[in-house]
C-alpha cells in the first residue's frame, strides 16, 4: 500500500510489522499481538491497538500508563479479545477467568463475573464526549475558528467525516467535542468514532500511534492549543448494567 511503498511501513499504525508479501509484492502490514492484517489508509481498530500495546515488550512501553484522568475507562489497560474484523468481543475475560461485558470502545459496562457471564451483543457506543482543558493563553480562542480547526483535524488526521462531529462547545478554558454515530449512520469507509477518539486521546498524551508523523500540533489561527487535561465520557445505545453496590 502506498505511503510506504519504498520502505514498507504503516503510516496510520506504528505497532505493526510490515513486509512486501501482499499481492503483486505490495506492502502488507499486520498488527502486533494479533497478527491481523490492517488497512494502513485508515485508523486501526482500538481493540487491535490495545492488543498490540499489551504485547509490546515492557521496555518498549515507556509511555504506557493508565490515565490518571480517566473517569469511565477506569479499569486501565487489558489484553482484549478481538473478533475477526478487529472489533471488541462483547465478553472479555482475564487469565483468572474473571469476565465482564464491554461496549464497542472496549470499556466495561457490567459488573465483573465468572465464565458463566453472558454478553449477548456488543453494545454500541454512539456518543462520545471529549472534555479538554487547555493551558492559559493570552485570550480566549474564537469559538468558530476552534470549531473549524477541530473538524479539520478530525477529518484530515483521523479521517472522521465532519458529520460525526456533532458539536464543539467552548467555555474558556474548557473545550468539549461531541462525537455521535449510530450504527445505521456509518457508510462504507467511515471511521468509527471510538477509534478516532482513541487516536486523539493518544495524540493528546504525546503517544501518537502514527508512523513517522510528527506529534499533534494543534493551532487555532496560529496560536498553539495545548491541552493539560482530558476526560472522555462514553454513552452507549443501551445503558450499562452495574449493580447498585457499585453505584454507591
Amino acid at each position: 500500500h502506498t505511503a510506504a511503498q519504498d520502505n514498507c511501513t504503516c503510516p496510520t499504525n506504528k505497532m505493526t510489522v510490515c513486509s512486501p508479501d501482499g499481492p503483486g509484492g505490495r506492502c502488507q502490514c499486520r498488527a502486533l499481538g494479533s497478527g491481523m492484517a490492517v488497512d494502513c489508509s485508515t485508523l486501526t481498530s482500538k481493540c487491535l491497538l490495545l492488543k498490540a500495546r499489551m504485547s509490546a515488550p515492557k521496555n518498549a512501553r515507556t509511555l504506557v500508563r493508565p490515565s490518571e484522568h480517566a473517569l469511565v475507562d477506569n479499569d486501565g489497560l487489558y489484553d482484549p479479545d478481538c473478533d475477526p474484523e478487529g472489533r471488541f468481543k462483547a465478553r472479555q475475560c482475564n487469565q483468572t477467568s474473571v469476565c465482564w461485558c464491554v461496549n464497542s470502545v472496549g470499556v466495561r459496562r457490567t459488573d465483573k463475573g465468572d465464565l458463566s457471564l453472558r454478553c449477548d451483543e456488543l453494545v454500541r457506543t454512539h456518543h462520545i464526549l471529549i472534555d479538554l482543558r487547555h493551558r492559559p493563553t493570552a485570550g480566549a480562542f474564537n469559538h468558530s475558528d476552534l470549531d473549524a480547526e477541530l473538524r479539520r483535524l478530525f477529518r484530515e488526521r483521523y479521517r472522521l467525516h465532519p458529520k460525526f462531529v456533532a458539536a464543539v462547545h467552548y467555555e474558556q478554558p474548557t473545550i468539549q467535542i461531541e462525537l455521535r454515530q449510530n450504527t445505521s449512520q456509518k457508510a462504507a469507509g467511515d471511521v468509527d468514532i471510538g477509534d478516532a477518539a482513541y487516536y486523539f486521546e493518544r495524540d493528546i498524551k504525546g503517544e501518537s500511534l502514527f508512523q513517522g508523523r510528527g506529534g499533534l500540533d494543534l493551532r487555532v489561527r496560529g496560536e498553539p492549543l495545548q491541552v493539560e487535561r482530558t476526560l472522555i465520557y462514553y454513552l452507549d445505545e443501551i445503558p450499562p448494567k452495574f449493580s447498585m453496590k457499585r453505584l454507591t
Epitope: H1, T2, A3, Q5, P11, S41, T42, R151, R152, R155, E156, R159, H161, P162, K163, N182, S184, Q185, K186, A187, A188, G189, D190, V191
Partner: antibody
Framework: QVQLVQSGAEVKKPGASVKVSCKAS????????MHWVRQAPGQGLEWMGE????????SYNQKFKGRVTITRDTSTSTAYMELSSLRSEDTAVYYC????????????WGQGTLVTVSS | DIQMTQSPSSLSASVGDRVTITCRAS??????LNWYQQKPGKAPKLLIY???RLHSGVPSRFSGSGSGTDFTLTISSLQPEDFATYFC??????????FGQGTKLEIK
C-alpha cells in the same frame, strides 16, 4: 452489479429549477455516500455535494450558495439533486457517483444528465 | 479549498509508449489521491484510489505513486483504448473535494 441510472436530459430557462434523479441498484443504497459532480461542456469536473442516504445528512460546495439541494428516497433507492436559480453557466452534464467514506473516491458513476439552460 | 494542478494538459503518444501524468496538490494531502479516466460522451471511471490502489477490473499497466503534494499516474504500455482524458481528485480535506483540470491523452 452496481448501477446508477439517471433521468433524461432537460432544457430549462434562466431562473428556473431542475431536479435530476439517480436510481441505484446492485448494492445497499444506505451503505454508501452519494455525491453529485458536474461537468460544463469541454471543462473539468466540479464536486457539488454529498448525501448519506441512511440519515439524510448532506453537505454542499459553498460555491453554489444554497442553490443546490440533495435529497433521497430510500424506498426507491433514488437520490435527487435540485439546482435552482439556473443561469446559462449551469449548462453542464450532471453526474451522481457512489463514494467511499475514507478515500472519498467515486467508484461508480451514473451515465450523466445534460441540463441546458437557455432563454 | 485545495487546488489540484495536472501536467501536461495534453500529450500525444503512440501505442506501446510509457506515459506519465503528474498531479500536484496545493497542500499536503497524504495519500488521498484518486485517478479517473473519461472518454468523450461517457462518465468518468475510477482507475486508482488512495494513490496506488487499482480499482477492480483496471488493467495492471496502470499504476500510481506519490505522497504529500506530488503524484503520478503511469501507463506502462499504452493500448488503443487508453486514449482518453485523465483527472486526479483529492479526498483528503473537508469538502469541497477537488479535481485537477484534466490531461488529454491523444494518439500521435
Amino acid at each position: 452489479q452496481v448501477q446508477l441510472v439517471q433521468s433524461g436530459a432537460e432544457v430549462k430557462k434562466p431562473g428556473a429549477s431542475v431536479k435530476v434523479s439517480c436510481k441505484a441498484s446492485g448494492y445497499t443504497f444506505t451503505s454508501y455516500w452519494m455525491h453529485w459532480v458536474r461537468q460544463a461542456p469541454g471543462q473539468g469536473l466540479e464536486w457539488m455535494g454529498e448525501i448519506t442516504p441512511s440519515d439524510n445528512y448532506t453537505s454542499y460546495n459553498q460555491k453554489f450558495k444554497g442553490r443546490v439541494t440533495i435529497t433521497r428516497d430510500t424506498s426507491t433507492s433514488t437520490a435527487y439533486m435540485e439546482l435552482s436559480s439556473l443561469r446559462s453557466e449551469d449548462t453542464a452534464v450532471y453526474y451522481c457517483a457512489r463514494g467511499h467514506g475514507n478515500y472519498v473516491s467515486f467508484d461508480y458513476w451514473g451515465q450523466g444528465t445534460l441540463v441546458t439552460v437557455s432563454s | 479549498d485545495i487546488q489540484m494542478t495536472q501536467s501536461p494538459s495534453s500529450l500525444s503518444a503512440s501505442v506501446g509508449d510509457r506515459v506519465t501524468i503528474t498531479c500536484r496538490a496545493s497542500q499536503d494531502i497524504s495519500n488521498y489521491l484518486n485517478w479517473y479516466q473519461q472518454k468523450p460522451g461517457k462518465a468518468p471511471k475510477l482507475l486508482i484510489y488512495y494513490t496506488s490502489r487499482l480499482h477492480s477490473g483496471v488493467p495492471s499497466r496502470f499504476s500510481g505513486s506519490g505522497s504529500g503534494t506530488d503524484f503520478t499516474l503511469t501507463i506502462s504500455s499504452l493500448q488503443p483504448e487508453d486514449f482518453a482524458t485523465y483527472f486526479c481528485q483529492q479526498g483528503y480535506s473537508l469538502p469541497p473535494y477537488t479535481f485537477g483540470q484534466g490531461t488529454k491523452l491523444e494518439i500521435k
